[in-house]
């Protein structure tokens, strides 16, 4: 038995996690670059 609501919910959750991870990586990179430039 499969129900789309669990896949919809989980896919949404994982997309949000991926975006958060990406933004953290980008912001972390920028911060390191700023520190390096100082």
């Amino acid at each position: 038995h499969s129900d789309g609501i669990f896949t919809d919910s989980y896919s949404r959750y994982r997309k949000q996690m991926a975006v958060k991870k990406y933004l953290a990586a980008v912001l972390g990179k920028r911060y390191k670059q700023r520190v390096k430039n100082k």
Epitope: S2, D3, G4, T7, Y10, S11, Y13, R14, Q16, M17
Partner: antibody, heavy 108, light 113 residues
């Protein structure tokens, strides 16, 4: 997935084969275990697209997730097994579709 | 690591009665609503009942209701039937960056008299 009897310190690989949908369709395959008479315990998840993984902190490198897109399988490698790892191991697609589970018994 | 405390661990109800199962999360689940409920009968894998704290899966009777947000969640079974005798588990989704992605509650055994 093939379970069975393993001696303490031994290893075992459990594999879950996708049927009715393709592993190449990309989703998260998660693994959950349940010791006899106990509750459910999350082990980890693997994304079938990139192979990206997340593990429960207690796993501590003892278990490893992998996937084979060509064979439409997701696998869980169990290492350094102890009696405490005796459990029914379930694979699940997005916590939506669940496999029947496979019993792993660790005993000397 | 996060903790999902499920209470009670066991509950007995008469047919037609009401069962309330609580799930308390520490910290809050992600987005305050990423919590699912599962039903498990002996010898079977879990079956999804409710996603996103309150969305009922198709084919699940309307006597099952999920509610709550953040750290406090409830599964209510109104008009309990014999078929509802099972173990029930909550599952939280968390911020993977700072803690484990998931945790299950300890489970609640529902006995129907």
């Amino acid at each position: 997935a093939e379970g069975g009897l393993v001696k303490p310190g031994g290893s075992l690989e459990l594999c879950c084969k996708a049927s009715g949908f393709s592993l190449s369709s990309t989703y998260w395959m998660c693994w959950v275990r349940q010791a006899p008479g106990k509750g459910l315990e999350w082990i980890g998840c693997i994304y079938t697209g990139s192979g990206s993984t997340d593990y429960a902190s207690w796993v501590n490198g003892q278990f490893t997730l992998s996937r084979d897109i060509d064979q439409s399988t997701g696998c869980l490698q169990l290492n350094s097994l102890t009696v405490a790892d005796t459990a029914m191991y379930y694979c699940t697609k997005n916590f939506d579709l669940w496999g029947p589970g496979t019993l792993v018994t660790v005993s000397s | 690591a996060q903790v999902l405390t499920q209470t009670p661990s066991s509950v007995s109800a008469a047919v037609g009665g009401t069962v309330t199962i609580n799930c308390q999360s520490s910290p809050s689940v992600y987005s305050n609503n990423y919590l699912s409920w599962f039903q498990q009968k002996p010898g079977q894998p879990p079956k999804g009942l409710i996603a996103d704290a309150s969305t009922l899966a198709s084919g699940v009777p309307s006597r099952f209701k999920g509610s709550g947000s953040g750290t406090q969640f409830t599964l209510t079974i109104s008009g309990v039937q014999c078929d509802d005798a099972a173990a029930y588990y909550c599952l939280g989704y968390y911020d993977c960056g700072s803690t484990d992605c998931h945790a299950f509650g300890g489970g609640t055994e529902v006995v129907v008299k």
